[in-house]
């Protein structure tokens, strides 16, 4: 057993261009806190996977308000160390995740809000009992400087905290086969304490609390002989005399994994895959309980009242993640139809619909022509969420109420003069042009470049546009 200790030295903008904006402002003061998550081995697991070696949250740092115009300085930090106790041996190699969180203290609805500013991760080798190791990690434009160490809790000593030390019983020397405990020369290494009940003849241990079996013996306490009677199972090495060895109960028989862990056999023993919130050889240890306040953004911690039960966070609408740490971008799913504008109000989604559409998701196409009349013989045409009128000749406007001036748009080309006529308009073309809109030049030989003039009309005559 022992404690992993993390000391944050600074968190601020990293070197180089593109310094980040301060996470706090006069309008939105904030303070920082940190979370550390430890996992055994050099794993590259997802950030959401269990912190099997343990996790810890720091206290909140001092409230910080940005000075307008000033560059983002190193931000004020919480006091004290982050301490992650570990119950079993220190693994020597470990992976870490250190998260920097911002607690916004502005007067926003819902009180303080939490958001993840930066997350750094790494894999390291570290012997317990050694000096502080210094580290610098960058996350985007931010830089985190920190130190860490692992130390054993008495009576454990050694690089893995597996050797036990006891005060000397005799003043001069340690007992038979036991060495003095460096650096505590006045103490003696104690014999390893195997798991209670572990067979002294057929079992042994390399770490406190374990029980490993000598060949030919099995079971959690190495008290069950390996049967050689017949070959009923493929388990065990083959033998020339018996054909094979069939163990009695397998290491996973009776499921030694607590708290819903699943057991799988390994060449030498078994391995438990633990549910979230549990770790240890048999999933018997819980890293985080509801008392640690693992749920952010108003999440409610359910279960996890003690180290023997996993917690879950029930997240308020708009947040998700195992700790309610992720804001849900519900508008990214484009829930508003027919070009509606999506608004995420936190507690609910709203769609602001374009004209002519309605419904919670703008899914209803309104009957644009319902109750709308087009004047002067016009007919209503639906389309695109808005009604329009197709007006009778000589009328215009949204509802065909305006008498149209057919010449207002200057329809006659090449200097032709426009005359309003009861059935439309007439263009009087300039010399050299012809057509309903005076659009065709007349060739010098008198023939038109495009359609011939209708019978009875000479080039240059006024062209009535019907």
């Amino acid at each position: 057993a022992g404690v992993f200790e993390l000391q944050i030295h600074s968190f601020g903008p990293g070197p180089g261009p593109g310094a980040p904006r301060s996470p706090c402002s006069a309008r939105l003061p904030c303070r920082l806190f940190f979370r550390v998550c430890l996992k055994p081995g050099l794993s590259e697991e997802a950030a959401e996977s269990p912190c099997a070696l343990g996790a810890a949250l720091s206290a909140r740092g001092p409230v910080y308000t940005e000075q307008p115009g000033a560059p983002a300085p190193d931000l004020p930090l919480p006091d004290g160390l982050l301490q992650v106790p570990f119950r079993d041996a220190w693994p020597g190699t470990f992976s870490f995740i250190i998260e920097t969180w911002r607690e916004e203290l502005g007067d926003q609805i819902g009180g303080p809000a939490w958001s993840l500013l930066a997350r750094v991760a790494g894999r390291r080798r570290l012997a317990a009992g050694g000096p502080w190791a210094r580290d610098i990690q960058r996350a985007g434009a931010w830089e985190l400087r920190f130190s860490y160490r692992a130390r054993c809790e008495p009576p454990a000593v050694g690089t893995a905290c597996t050797r036990l030390c006891r005060p000397r019983s005799a003043p001069s020397r340690c007992g038979p086969g036991l060495r003095p405990c460096a650096p505590l020369e006045d103490e003696c290494e104690a014999p390893l304490v195997c798991r209670a009940g572990c067979s002294p003849e057929h079992g042994f241990c390399e770490q406190p609390g374990e029980c490993r079996c000598l060949e030919g013996w099995t079971g959690p306490l190495c008290t069950v002989p390996v049967s050689t009677s017949s070959c009923l199972s493929p388990r065990g090495p083959s033998s020339a005399t018996t054909g094979c060895l069939v163990p009695g109960p397998g290491p996973c028989d009776g499921n030694p994994c607590a708290n819903g862990g699943s057991c799988s056999e390994t060449p030498r023993s078994f391995e438990c895959t633990c549910p979230r919130g549990f770790y240890g050889l048999r999933c018997e240890v819980s890293g985080v309980t509801c008392a640690d306040g693992p749920c952010f953004n108003g999440g409610l911690c359910v279960g996890g009242a003690d180290p023997d039960s996993a917690y879950i966070c029930h997240c308020p609408p708009g947040f998700q993640g195992s700790n309610c740490e992720k804001r849900v971008d519900r508008c990214s799913l484009q829930p508003c139809r027919n070009g509606g504008l999506c608004l995420d109000l936190g507690h609910a989604l709203r769609c602001r619909c374009r004209a002519g559409f309605a419904g919670p998701r703008c899914e209803h196409d309104l009957d644009d022509c319902a109750g709308r009349a087009c004047a002067n013989g016009g007919t209503c045409v639906e389309g695109g969420g808005a009604h329009r009128c197709s007006c009778a000749l000589g009328f215009g406007g949204r509802d065909c109420r305006e008498r149209a001036d057919p010449c207002a748009a200057r329809p006659c080309a090449h200097g032709g003069r426009c005359y309003a006529h009861f059935s439309g308009l007439v263009c009087a073309c300039a010399p050299g042009y012809m057509g309903a809109r005076c659009e065709f030049p007349v060739h010098p030989d008198g023939a038109s470049a495009l359609p011939a003039a209708p019978p009875g009309l000479r080039p240059g005559d006024p062209q009535r546009y019907l």
Epitope: G111, G293, G304, A305, H314, G318
Partner: antibody, heavy 118, light 108 residues
Framework: QVQLQESGPGLVKPSETLSLTCTVS????????WSWIRQPPGKCLEWIGY???????NYNPSLKSRVTISVDTSKNQFSLKLSSVTAADTAVYYC????????????WGQGTLVTVSS | EIVLTQSPGTLSLSPGERATLSCRAS???????LAWYQQKPGQAPRLLIY???SRATGIPDRFSGSGSGTDFTLTISRLEPEDFAVYYC?????????FGCGTKVEIK
């Protein structure tokens, strides 16, 4: 304006099941968690449980074996069933909306008194 | 579960006086997830404060909340006639959600 209205019988016989419905107006039932709370005459408030439209529920361990909360999004209603009632279940039963900022109660119904008596 | 103990049970004061109500938790309430409610006879409770110190919409500024960890306080700076009621605290840090048993503020 958000309004909640409890409805159901005011008198239930011992060992029977108490059934109440809360009708919500002014808010979509799909956007919030919804809860039941009770208060025996002259006594403290006791949280019974809550539900989210997705079906997520959470009940007070002291009542868990007897409580079922359900939701009907089409009617914008949620309901409470409490089985095997005794005189100790006599109380004013409130339905309430759980706030967005956390699991506290920002809107309450006016409450309905349920008496357990033969 | 977190047990909330409110004190005093009854507070006898006159209009215009300052009222200080206490709510003590059996375990630390993380992130100040604590709310205060006011209840008048025959009515449902009404939310006053959440997050230990944030006033709910429409609540007058004579009501203020403070505290953290296990000790929380509701203060009414100058009692108005309509403030005489029972006040409850509630934690929403972890399940089960729990209420205190109330402090009655009565006219002296």
């Amino acid at each position: 304006q958000v309004q909640l209205q409890e409805s159901g019988p005011g008198l239930v016989k011992p060992s029977e099941t108490l059934s109440l419905t809360c009708t919500v107006s002014g808010a979509s039932i799909s956007s919030f968690y919804w809860s039941w709370i009770r208060q025996p005459p002259g006594k403290c408030l006791e949280w019974i449980g809550y539900i989210y439209y997705s079906g997520t529920t959470n009940y007070n361990p002291s009542l868990k074996s007897r409580v079922t909360i359900s939701v009907d999004t089409s009617k914008n209603q949620f309901s409470l069933k409490l089985s095997s009632v005794t005189a100790a279940d006599t109380a004013v039963y409130y339905c309430a909306r759980i706030a967005v900022a956390g699991f506290f109660f920002d809107y309450w119904g006016q409450g309905t008194l349920v008496t357990v008596s033969s | 579960e977190i047990v909330l103990t409110q004190s005093p049970g009854t507070l006898s004061l006159s209009p215009g006086e300052r009222a200080t109500l206490s709510c003590r938790a059996s375990q630390s309430v993380n992130k100040n997830y604590l709310a205060w409610y006011q209840q008048k006879p025959g009515q449902a409770p009404r939310l006053l404060i959440y997050g230990a110190s944030s006033r709910a919409t429409g609540i007058p500024d004579r009501f203020s909340g403070s505290g953290s960890g296990t000790d929380f306080t509701l203060t009414i700076s100058r009692l108005e006639p309509e403030d005489f009621a029972v006040y409850y605290c509630q934690q929403y840090d972890r399940s089960p959600l729990t209420f205190g048993c109330g402090t009655k503020v009565e006219i002296k």
